[in-house]
Interface confidence: low
């Protein structure tokens, strides 16, 4: 059960896993969520005790029953991890803490203009986990404007004290804001000789890299493959660091692979979610439960649905036995990784998928596309919504796309002249308009945000956000699409689809079933030659065939132009305008979403 509420003046009794220091209950909850074992926590605020050494302690807890007895405790704040929640979770923590000194290893001291610059310096320093900045009002003159960069083994402070006129905060590397070099190469037959800060078992080098990426102290790693000569060291993932931040020595070692943490990469990468299956592989760990299920996928689902399960091994039965069901061993460990990995025993192993929501949920795979045909099927475009207007009579108005659990992206021209968001309804998980009846669940719209430079579709800025009144739970039928990457990957979209319930041709009517059309992107220059009377800007993009035929039309407006890259769907365009529908040499014109990513983030994070 997902509990987001925090309980003030309340403590949870027992179940302690570990204690760390945290500047706030919200940060403590974030740490609990990312900790492999923590299900609940108690945070001791600065009013919680006569003893200042207990202030700002964050006690991470676990319980077989997923809850613990609550007791009255002055100044304590308790709550549950977000592991139990369906919504997306980010490790990014931007808050600044005034009059708090977060203690750690002060390894660098520099002068900065303000706390924001200090935070930026921390984000762009490979070792920095958090910082404390002495403001210009700080009592000691020689320390004013001094920015102390700090690190600890755990990435969290070793103590937190109240100190007037200082500001503390965390590195924003987890917000993908670092400018440090991002090295994605995996180096075969290579071992890095630097000191190990930790070692865990991993089934392959990519899981090892993901573990390194979200381990606070790991900067690079060496993975000893299953062919490694020394049996006891096979599948060992050695997490490493060095004073310089990069490997000092590399050794040529067969059957070892090495690489770097992706913590400084400027795009969202799946670092928590290990979705692969490992055949003929057994994961050892503390056994949580054994259940009979049909197939390894069902076993993974079982593990994902069991909140304490971290990984599993499925042992298939011969087809003739037990109705084809096998044994599903649900397991856990202190660090979330198997205690040992064995090969050649016939098991199929993998990890819980509940950590996938800590990565961007939009990156998870969806049902395979049905090739050919113009009608879509259920779950094919789970981000597509139908936006209805209820006055004077209820009808489909425009399309839109889910980009967050409370946010829909659509076209500005759909919303111009609406007197109130109250007459809008968002229906998600819908394939046929006929599914929309009086009692069909919908999301009300709390707020309409139209780009303030919008005048008319043909001039650009045809983009708007709808904030939903309530947050959406993601399912296979309704979930977000990724915004296009502003990060550091080459993106040339080869497969793009436009979807909607719009007309099939001018003068037609709204379609019942969601239609889809595969359309190629057209260069701006090419598009400009087709629309001589309009200025096709870099904030627009065009798609369609020279011979016409497949195109968006009336009623599709605001809907997505979805393009697939590296198995992930991106919202590349918003259906905006065009000359006719599917006319020869008249491609559809779309809002170029990548040019508005900053605007989208600014609006969705500010409200």
């Amino acid at each position: 059960e997902c509990v987001t509420k925090l309980f003030t003046d309340t403590g949870f009794q027992g179940g302690d896993v570990t204690t760390i220091f945290s500047p706030s209950a919200k940060h403590c909850q974030l740490i609990c969520t990312h900790h492999p074992r923590c299900l609940l926590f108690t945070f001791m605020a600065d009013s919680s005790s006569e003893d200042p050494t207990r202030w700002f302690t964050c006690i991470l807890k676990d319980s077989v029953t997923e809850t613990l007895p609550r007791v009255n405790m002055t100044g304590a704040i308790s709550g549950y991890s977000f592991k139990q929640c369906p919504h997306q979770i980010s490790a990014c923590h931007r808050n600044l803490y005034v009059d708090l000194d977060m203690k750690g290893m002060n390894y660098n001291s520099l002068m900065t203009r303000d706390a924001q610059e200090c935070q930026e310096r921390c984000t762009n320093d490979v070792h920095c986990h958090f910082f404390t900045y002495a403001t210009r009002q700080f009592p000691s003159t020689e320390h004013r404007n001094i920015c102390l960069l700090k690190y600890t083994h755990m990435g969290t402070p070793t103590r937190i004290m109240k100190l007037t006129k200082v500001v503390s905060g965390f590195s924003l590397k987890s917000c993908a804001l670092s400018k440090l070099a991002c090295i994605r190469d995996i180096f075969p037959s290579t071992a890095f000789a630097d000191s190990n800060i930790d070692s865990v078992m991993a089934p392959d080098v990519f899981v090892c890299r993901r573990i390194c990426t979200h381990h606070p102290g790991c900067l690079f790693f060496t993975f000893l493959s299953q062919e490694w000569p020394k049996e006891s060291e096979r599948n060992l993932c050695l997490l490493k660091t060095s004073e310089s931040g990069l490997p000092s020595t590399r050794i040529k070692k067969d059957r070892a692979l090495s690489g770097f943490s992706l913590q400084t990469c400027r795009h969202s990468v799946p670092v928590f979610c290990h979705s692969s299956f490992y055949h003929d592989t057994d994961f050892l760990g503390e056994e949580l439960d054994i259940v009979d299920v049909k197939g390894h996928e069902a076993c993974q689902k079982m593990c994902t649905d069991s909140i304490r399960c971290q990984f599993f091994t499925y042992s298939p039965s011969p087809e003739s036995c037990n109705g084809g069901k096998g044994k599903c061993y649900l397991k856990l460990s202190s660090n979330g990784s198997p205690t040992k990995i064995l090969h050649g025993r016939g098991g199929i192993s993998g990890y819980t998928l509940r950590l996938c929501k800590m990565d961007n949920v939009c990156t998870t795979k969806i049902k395979p596309r049905i090739v050919g045909g113009e009608a879509s099927v259920h779950g094919e475009w789970p981000w597509q919504i139908t936006l209805h207007i209820t006055s004077p009579a209820q009808r489909h108005l425009c399309g839109g796309s889910i980009i967050g659990n409370q946010w829909i992206l659509t076209a500005a021209h759909c919303l111009i002249g609406l007197e109130s968001p109250k007459i809008l309804r968002v229906y998600s998980g819908i394939l046929n308009q006929s599914e929309v009846k009086k009692d069909t669940a919908f999301f009300g719209v709390q707020e309409i945000i139209i780009h303030d430079q919008y005048e008319m579709a043909e001039s650009g800025y045809d983009i708007a956000l709808l904030k939903l009144e309530t947050a959406m739970n993601y399912t296979d039928a309704q979930r977000p699409i990724c915004l296009p990457s502003k990060g550091d990957r080459s993106v040339i979209y080869a497969e793009c689809w436009v979807t909607g319930w719009g007309y099939r041709k001018l003068g037609d009517k709204i379609q019942n079933t969601l239609q889809k059309a595969n359309v190629p992107l057209v260069t701006t220059e090419e598009c400009q030659t087709r629309y001589r009377g309009h200025k096709i800007t870099n904030k627009m993009l065009c798609a369609g065939y020279q011979e016409g035929g497949k195109d968006a039309c009336k009623g599709d407006s605001g809907g997505p132009l979805s393009c697939k890259h590296n198995d992930v769907w991106h919202l590349v365009g918003i259906t905006s305008w065009g000359e006719g529908c599917g006319q020869r040499e008249r491609p559809g014109v779309y809002t170029n979403v990548v040019e508005y990513v900053d605007w989208i983030l600014e609006k969705t994070q500010a409200v």
Epitope: K179, R184, G245, D488, R489, V491, V597
Partner: antibody
Framework: QVQLEESGPGLVAPSQSLSITCTVS????????IYWVRQPPGKGLEWLGM???????DYNSALKSRLSISKDNSKSQVFLKMNSLQTDDTARYYC??????????WGQGTTLTVSS | DIVMTQSHKFMSTSVGDRVSITCKAS??????VAWYQQKPGQSPKLLIY???YRNTGVPDRFTGSGSGTDFTFTISSVQAEDLAVYYC?????????FGGGTKLERL
Amino acid sequence: QVQLEESGPGLVAPSQSLSITCTVSGFSLTGYGIYWVRQPPGKGLEWLGMIWGDGRTDYNSALKSRLSISKDNSKSQVFLKMNSLQTDDTARYYCARDYYGSKDYWGQGTTLTVSS
Amino acid sequence: DIVMTQSHKFMSTSVGDRVSITCKASQDVSTAVAWYQQKPGQSPKLLIYLTSYRNTGVPDRFTGSGSGTDFTFTISSVQAEDLAVYYCQQHYKTPYSFGGGTKLERL
């Protein structure tokens, strides 16, 4: 395949401004940083600045006040603008793709002469 | 900004010789140093990155070493086609910066 090509005015008078375009193909500008380097005749390489895939910029401190780098992702073009040119800005100007690991690509460069 | 200094502007060598070019950084750049080769009329070509990693297709006579502030680029057996200018560059932190270059010429 990956290609970068610089185009510039060739000759500019002192105190005037410079605008050089780097047109890329084979990859998307939303995905990679592009940096600018110049080389005066018979001299070494000087790193001028760069624009990241997400549009943020970094500049050589000594030239920051005169430099501006921008881009148009849809046209696959990056622009270097430099004002108050002097004769010692005479150089060959290169654009290069920022590499991650071992991938590195440079344009052939465009020659700029600052002279009255 | 980080300043990269190559102490030798010129170095003389013969075919078959072993030659080492040094580069010093004004502050710790970890091992994020690259080495470029430039021949007359050509764009620079990346040989080594992250101090010791050879770029694809670069012969193994070219090696790099060092960390922190002191770096060395070595050609174990100079070939005629190696006569060129060599530059070090720090790619630890923007703004990236180059050394002044070392011209390798025939003795």
